[in-house]
């Protein structure tokens, strides 16, 4: 999943959780598969750069092997760099694993703008801050990118946590996460938590951008407030779901809901921004110039180039709407709805701020695949992904980034007939060609 | 077609108040399309942005002369109008008055300028 | 901050020669640049905006190039009324604040 807009979200210590804790409320969720509770030892254990990707520190072959990997639920493949490249500190050395075995297979990934293609074979995996266990893994070793890797992000490969049909060359490769829950007895479920950083930071706190958790096997309870509220997984490919509204501060874009999921509503955790179809986008960027009327941005500022920059600490959050996406809910007929504050959708970018100023990327664009929900949604919640279940719940992040205004919410449920209609069926055509728009 | 034209006093004394407006001919200073600009030239020297507006009245200064900055609109009579408060001999300058165009990016039309003198 | 330098200070060229001025940006502003004329006793004159596009009534011997940290502005032949100083400008954060120092390029 390209973050930068599909990064790899092509950003580390987290400190305290940003922002202010909201009370919990009562758990109202029937029981969950997997362990309940405290996962300590995956907490904060990813870290990042601001628009760069969240990455996981993994470790592949005997003797390990330590590697930072990028956290895409957008992609199927786990793949790491495995040759010398400008922008790789280290990379997976195959032949100093006594426990690689090859696969005798090529593999070949493109990308609207660039690509990477490598060697198939299996290797030991294990996560230091996850689940302690070691599983056999289908590994893509990189040998040749273009245009994949980013300078100064720190991760030196990709784990795609999304499912086998969309895996590359076929959905004949088992993705790591199905081989680590056949191979062991972790609960086929995982959550994420994505701290932005929420403020520019300067080059020595950009060593320590962002942080966040990924949790494998279960929820952590610490890392929300509220409750969860589940939508149905529409396929298993993508993360897909089905979104049937769309509201800008409370003001209904009044859109057929089938023009939101046209031609996917997909959860990503490899893009950085809200990708919205072309319709959709226009739409909202409108009602959010509407809303912010007092001020004036440039042309670009809107098309996610120009950056916008206020004296520190002085962004005027309040001139910017909150953005409301209604999800598909787990019983008929009823909806709920996740609000992201502009703290989420204004992305500060910390390489030209000064002290003297805060400066902001708007991180909502246009897609040509579909809705994306990514790290600019993500950040806002904590996400179950319960794969057992086949569905996906949210949450309000216990890190998300707010004022004493307003808060990143997920509320329900709400009464919306006919759902079943905002999915877009896909004609029935060869699908190999739908991950190469990954912009 | 559109023009724009700054005036006010020449000459200020310093530690007084540096008034100008610039009126705007030709065209309405109340379209949702542009922005409205300060920019000072001392002489001799490159140009140094002092702020703009919008016709709602949300003003962006320059940080190093936000605390003495005050830059108005007044859309009745097609003006705004900058003050600069506390000059000294460095306030000195050719002040000159723009639209900011272009996608609300580039000043792609100025006013002639008038030089401001601060001297006792 | 983004600073912007021009080079050179001074350009000294006869009418007719083709004259090349640089801006370098101290990061990426990925094309959002202008360049403006300014002669002896005028307002600056927008040239270019959006680093290679004319402004409207800008001769076409008026050309700027360039994205990312790097720009040039090229006069293909220089007339007599081009003597004067130019200044880029960065917009790529906004408000427009930045201007380089100018070039100034005058008659051999």
């Known amino acids: 999943t390209h973050l930068g807009i599909r990064l790899p979200l092509r950003s580390g210590l987290a400190g305290p959780p940003l922002g202010l804790r909201l009370p919990r409320e009562t758990d109202e969720e029937s029981e969950e598969p997997g362990r309940r509770g405290s996962f300590v030892e995956m907490v904060d254990n990813l870290r990042g750069k601001s628009g760069q990707g969240y990455y996981v520190e993994m470790t592949v072959g005997s003797p390990p092997q330590t590697l930072n990997i990028l956290v895409d639920t957008g992609s199927s493949n786990f793949a790491v760099g495995a040759a010398p490249h400008p922008f790789l500190h280290r990379y997976y050395q195959r032949q100093l694993s006594s426990t690689y075995r090859d696969l005798r297979k090529g593999v070949y990934v493109p990308y609207t703008q660039g690509k990477w293609e490598g060697e198939l074979g299996t290797d030991l995996v294990s996560i230091p801050h996850g689940p302690n266990v070691t599983v056999r893994a289908n590994i893509a070793a990189i040998t040749e990118s273009d245009k994949f890797f980013i300078n100064g992000s720190n991760w030196e490969g990709i784990l795609g946590l999304a499912y086998a049909e969309i895996a590359r060359p076929d959905d004949s490769l088992e993705p790591f996460f199905d081989s680590l829950v056949k191979q062991t007895h972790i609960p086929n479920i995982f959550s994420l938590q994505l701290c932005g950083a929420g403020f520019p930071l300067n080059q020595t706190e950009a060593l320590a951008s962002v942080g966040g958790s990924m949790i494998i096997g279960g929820i952590d309870h610490s890392l929300y407030t509220g409750r969860l509220w589940y939508t149905p997984i529409r396929r298993e490919w993508y993360y897909e779901v089905i979104i049937v509204r769309v509201e800008i501060n409370g003001q209904d874009l009044k859109m057929d809901c089938k023009e939101y999921n046209y031609d996917k509503s997909i959860v990503d955790s490899g893009t950085t921004n809200l990708r919205l179809p072309k319709k959709v986008f226009e739409a909202a960027v409108k009602s959010i110039k509407a809303a912010s009327s007092t001020e004036k941005f440039p042309d670009g500022f809107w098309l996610g180039e120009q950056l916008v920059c206020w004296q520190a600490g002085t962004t005027p959050w309040n001139i910017f709407p909150v953005i409301s996406l209604y999800l598909m809910g787990e019983v008929t007929n009823q909806s709920f709805r996740i609000t992201i504050l502009p703290q989420q959708y204004l992305r500060p970018v910390e390489d030209v701020a000064t002290s003297q100023d805060d400066c902001y990327k708007f991180a909502v664009s246009q897609s040509s695949t579909g809705t994306v929900m990514g790290a600019v949604i993500m950040e806002g919640f904590y996400v179950v992904f319960d794969r057992a279940r086949k569905r996906i719940g949210f949450a309000v992040s216990a890190c998300h980034v707010h004022d004493e205004f307003r808060t990143a919410a997920v509320e329900g449920p709400f009464v919306t007939a006919d759902m079943e209609d905002c999915g877009y069926n896909i004609p029935q055509t060869d699908e190999s060609t739908l991950m190469t728009g990954r912009a | 077609q559109l023009q724009l034209q700054e005036s006010g006093p020449g000459l200020v004394k310093p530690s007084e108040t540096l008034s100008l407006t610039c009126t705007v001919s030709?065209?309405?200073?109340?379209?949702?399309?542009?922005?409205w600009g300060w920019i000072r030239q001392p002489p001799g020297k490159g140009l140094e942005w002092i702020g703009m507006?919008?016709?709602?009245?949300?003003?962006w200064y320059n940080p190093s002369l936000k605390s003495r900055v005050t830059i108005s609109v007044d859309t009745s009579k097609n003006q705004f109008s900058l003050k600069l408060s506390s000059v000294t001999a460095a306030d000195t300058a050719v002040y000159y008055c723009?639209?900011?165009?272009?996608?609300?990016?580039?000043?792609?039309?100025w006013g002639r300028g008038t030089l401001v003198t601060v001297s006792s | 901050e983004i600073v912007l330098t021009q080079s050179p200070a001074t350009l000294s060229l006869s009418p007719g020669e083709r004259a090349t001025l640089s801006c370098r940006a101290s990061?990426?502003?990925?094309?959002?640049l202008a360049w403006y004329q300014q002669k002896p006793g005028q307002a600056p004159r927008l040239l270019i905006y959006?680093?290679?596009k004319r402004a409207t009534g800008i001769p076409a011997r008026f050309s700027g190039s360039g994205s990312g940290t790097d720009f040039t502005l090229t006069i293909s032949s220089l007339e007599p009324e081009d003597f004067a100083v130019y200044y880029c400008?960065?917009?790529?954060?906004?408000?427009?604040?930045?201007f380089g120092g100018g070039t100034k390029v005058e008659i051999k």
């Open positions: 400008q960065q917009v790529y954060t906004w408000p427009p604040r930045t």
């Open positions: 030709g065209g309405s200073i109340s379209s949702s399309s542009y922005y």
């Open positions: 990061q990426s502003v990925s094309s959002y």
């Open positions: 723009a639209r900011v165009g272009h996608g609300v990016s580039y000043f792609d039309l």
């Open positions: 959006g680093a290679s």
């Open positions: 507006i919008y016709y709602s009245g949300s003003t």
